[in-house]
Interface confidence: low
């Protein structure tokens, strides 16, 4: 079989299977139109020359008027595919060149087809990822916000129950304060009692104050950190970033959890051991009710 | 060194009155707390009350507040707790304790008998 | 009132064994983070020793073979490796809420 033939054959298989590619089809008529014109008018300029050597020379014409017209005229594809079709019957050096480059269009098409099948296989989990994240993110968030209902309900308990604890306290301490004015009618004790009484009033309002602002503190620093998530406006690419920033951004955060909770623990252990060191003193500066208030930490 | 030093053992006949101290050393007196604990024979503890030795002030557990009364001598650093119309519920033995129940006396221990 | 509730009311644990009480509370005994549940060790005809404070700390002194943990109602005192000397009775007692409470105590013996 020759050189000739071979292409012949392989053409033809080439034909059937780019027949079975139809979104292509249109543009590769376009082109085998143009590849057409050209290699007629290579031809007959071939056959018109009397030497051999003018025959090669024309043949390099050829050539160029082939190639030429396909660089300028060229429509752009309308597809990921690339010109694949070589000429009908090349002769001599033309089907080693063409054999070559049709082999390697061949090869780059394949290529770039698995490259867009794992572009998309990426994509599509990476969407999915993405579902899952802003999901996890939901969900944690609600259950932060129960949580903190939660705690406040128990707190607007808590300081209930030492209202109420520490009105009646108040009140024994009262009671007893007219049975020891009346058993010992003295003015000057009256009057220590009474400012001792002011004093702590003044003290209890002086921390409720302090407490007040370190909450203001607290509240304004959580909602510095609370950023807004936009993302409507952004492209794959720039989701794809926003997630593995967000992811980053959720390591981090955990990270610093971890490492406050150390950290917590630590000095609560040194402020329990203060705190049940000077418990008790604190409790003697202060009426009881008030000193179970003032007497622990925010 | 903080110690609290307690009265002697206590034989008193029911429907009496009995006052046990409790005296302080090693601290400052104005500073903490004087709690008092009973425990009855081969039982629990129980939580009486709290004293400021600084001014007086008390709180009772309420089952005792009708049994027993707390006191304070600055003068003396002493803690004082009486405990009146006496039945046979209440032998046990009391103690003083301070500081958030860290610093404990040795204990009193009453007997009520005919 | 709070009530604490102790158990075993009694265990025998052998020399070099883990010895491990529970207490539980009628209602949270936590505050902000930290639960203000104590343990205490009495031995016969000696007042009560305070061992841990707010739930977990061990009290200076106290040999680090006692270990407490939990927090809001459910409570444990460990003892690993229990210790010929340990054999006495214990007692939880929260310091949150007026009245303070004791448990009713557990009473340890070494086999």
């Known amino acids: 079989m020759s050189d000739i033939e071979e292409v012949v054959e392989e053409y033809e298989e080439e034909e059937q299977e780019e027949a079975a590619v139809e979104e292509e089809e249109d543009w590769r008529e376009d082109e085998d139109e143009q590849e057409e014109a050209a290699e007629e008018d290579a031809e007959a300029e071939a056959e018109t020359e009397e030497t051999r050597a003018e025959e090669d020379e024309e043949e390099e014409e050829a050539k160029e008027a082939e190639d030429g017209p396909m660089e300028e005229s060229k429509p752009k594809p309308r597809s990921f595919m690339p010109n694949l079709v070589p000429p009908k019957i090349p002769d001599g050096e033309r089907v080693d060149f063409d054999d070559i480059h049709r082999k390697r269009m061949e090869k780059d098409l394949n290529e770039l087809q698995a490259l867009i099948e794992a572009h998309f296989e990426n994509r599509k989990k990476e969407e999915e990822e993405l579902v899952s994240l802003k999901d996890r993110i939901e969900r944690r968030r609600a259950e932060r916000a129960e949580q903190q209902r939660i705690r406040n309900e128990r707190e607007k308990e808590r300081q209930n129950r030492l209202a109420e604890e520490r009105a009646r306290r108040e009140e024994e301490e009262n009671r007893r304060k007219a049975e020891d004015e009346a058993r010992k009618k003295k003015a000057l004790s009256n009057m220590m009692h009474f400012g001792g009484y002011i004093q702590k009033q003044a003290q209890t309002e002086r921390k409720s104050g302090k407490r007040q602002t370190e909450r203001e503190k607290k509240k304004k620093i959580l909602a510095e950190r609370r950023k807004v998530l936009a993302i409507d406006h952004l492209n794959e690419d720039q989701l794809r970033e926003k997630a593995k920033e967000l992811w980053q951004s959720i390591y981090n955060l955990e990270a610093e959890k971890f490492d406050l909770q150390e950290k917590f623990k630590q000095q609560k252990y040194e402020i329990n051991v203060l705190r049940n060191r000077i418990n008790d003193n604190q409790k003697v500066s202060k009426t009881r009710g008030k000193a179970k208030v003032t007497g622990r930490w925010k | 060194e903080v110690q609290l030093q307690q009265s002697g053992p206590e034989l008193v006949k029911p429907g009496a009155s009995v006052k046990m101290s409790c005296k302080a050393s090693g601290y400052t007196f104005t500073d903490y707390y004087m709690k008092w604990v009973k425990q009855s024979h081969g039982k629990s503890l129980e939580w009486i009350g709290d004293?400021?030795?600084?001014?007086?002030?008390?709180f009772y557990n309420q089952k005792f507040k009708d049994k027993a009364t707390l006191t304070v001598d600055k003068s003396s650093s002493t803690a004082y707790m009486q405990l009146n119309s006496l039945t046979s519920e209440d032998s046990a033995v009391y103690y003083c304790?301070?500081?958030?129940?860290?610093?404990w006396g040795q204990g009193t221990t009453l007997t009520v008998s005919s | 009132d709070i009530v604490l509730t102790q158990s075993p009311a009694s265990l025998a644990v052998s020399l070099g064994q883990r010895a491990t009480i529970s207490c539980k509370a009628s209602q949270s005994v936590d505050y902000d983070g930290t639960s203000y549940m104590n343990w205490f060790q009495q031995k016969a005809g000696q007042p009560p020793k305070r061992l841990i404070y707010a739930a977990s700390n061990l009290e200076s002194g106290i040999p680090a073979r006692f270990s407490g943990r939990g927090s809001g109602t459910d409570f444990a005192l460990n003892i690993h490796p229990v210790e010929e000397e340990d054999a006495a009775t214990y007692y939880c007692q929260q310091s949150n809420e007026d009245p303070y409470t004791f448990g009713g105590g557990t009473k340890l013996e070494i086999k």
């Open positions: 304790a301070t500081r958030v129940f860290d610093y």
């Open positions: 004293i400021n030795p600084n001014n007086g002030e008390t």
